[in-house]
Amino acid sequence: ISCGSPPPILNGRISYYSTPIAVGTVIRYSCSGTFRLIGEKSLLCITKDKVDGTWDKPAPKCEYFNKYSSCPEPIVPGGYKIRGSTPYRHGDSVTFACKTNFSMNGNKSVWCQANNMWGPTRLPTCVSVFPLECPALPMIHNGHHTSENVGSIAPGLSVTYSCESGYLLVGEKIINCLSSGKWSAVPPTCEE
């Protein structure tokens, strides 16, 4: 079982390989000096049907380096970064993992593209392995909370409360959504 020629790449090169390309072979892409690689650099020759070989993912692309590009902090609810740090320049990558009791959908790594957006795929999502969710927490008078979604929240996530200037937070600042579908504490209050 073997794979066909790896997909070509513009403004880059492919690592050496011999033919036929055996299942299990890895080929690596790189870009010319003034270009940046966007996407996974390694492709693996696999077989899904034990008859034909196929490449396990699409080839990356080489983008002309844009020194003015910069990408925003990527946020994955229920996940955290295991690689990558700000500032995010063209060609930089960020890799995510999911918190305990969350499973990942999508590709764990994304790249900062010339258009200031993360790609070539969407940010991964971390999905709670528990069907239970915590109900939406209320806003508090003279204060705010960090929850981005107004609907229910998956176990493992947390909400942080803060008070407006001149008010004091009484109670728990951070409230966690437990695997039972209940909140770890009642919302705090903001008092003068």
Partner: antibody, heavy 119, light 106 residues
Framework: QVQLVQSGAEVKKPGSSVKVSCKAS????????ISWVRQAPGQGLEWMGR????????NYAQKFQGRVTITADKSTSTAYMELSSLRSEDTAVYYC????????????WGQGTLVTVSS | EIVMTQSPATLSVSPGERATLSCRAG??????LAWYQQKPGQAPRLLIY???TRATGIPARFSGSGSGTEFTLTISSLQSEDFAVYYC????????FGQGTKLEIK
């Protein structure tokens, strides 16, 4: 970090076979590749082959083709290397090493297994 | 098979001084090169990958450079724990190691 724990030292007769195990803990066993690298006494490192457990695919260095078999048991997160038709030149420390995401380099290594081939 | 050649075979340097180790590939390997450190009775430890990226937890005194066929590992100020054998490894086409450079105390 992934921990790789190998089986103990072996003494074998020429012509026989040896099977060395490498148990992984931490990380997702099926998502990385395990290579076997050997080192004869006072010598350098020599790549023998590798397996990608999730695919069950093994590839071997030409020098060892036909004499080495690398397998993996996903249920126990264990990789195995069997070397047959042993000769005295096969006396070496055998290491398993982990490669993440087809990176090509080895972040984690087993402690090594000394295989002595002697009559 | 891509042949990797390291030089010198043995390098004698005093603690606090700079050490420069070389690795040459038999054909271009782009930047697909790793460096390992090995001490007696221990498994190798990854120092550098992709020719110049330090692995997690590796001190800043270790640096790698080069691309194509010529590569260098530099240890800026040698500590007592740095005296060991160093191996380069290519991963452009499967995997091969250099024969090693022994770094000893002068």
């Amino acid at each position: 970090q992934v921990q790789l724990v190998q089986s103990g030292a072996e003494v074998k007769k020429p012509g026989s076979s040896v099977k060395v195990s490498c148990k992984a803990s931490g990380g997702t066993f099926s998502s990385y590749a395990i290579s076997w690298v050997r080192q004869a006494p006072g010598q350098g490192l020599e790549w023998m082959g590798r397996i990608i457990p999730i695919l069950g695919i093994a590839n071997y260095a030409q020098k060892f083709q036909g004499r080495v078999t690398i397998t993996a048991d996903k249920s126990t997160s264990t990789a195995y290397m069997e070397l047959s038709s042993l000769r005295s030149e096969d006396t070496a420390v055998y290491y398993c090493a982990r490669e993440d995401d087809s990176s090509g380099y080895y972040q984690d290594w087993g402690q090594g297994t000394l295989v002595t081939v002697s009559s | 098979e891509i042949v990797m050649t390291q030089s010198p075979a043995t390098l004698s340097v005093s603690p606090g001084e700079r050490a420069t180790l070389s690795c040459r590939a038999g054909q271009s390997i782009n930047s697909y090169l790793a460096w390992y450190q090995q001490k007696p009775g221990q498994a190798p430890r990854l120092l550098i990958y992709d020719a110049s990226t330090r692995a997690t937890g590796i001190p800043a005194r270790f640096s790698g450079s080069g691309s194509g066929t010529e590569f260098t590992l530099t240890i800026s100020s040698l500590q007592s724990e740095d005296f060991a054998v160093y191996y380069c490894q290519q991963y452009e086409y499967w995997y091969t190691f250099g024969q090693g450079t022994k770094l000893e105390i002068k």
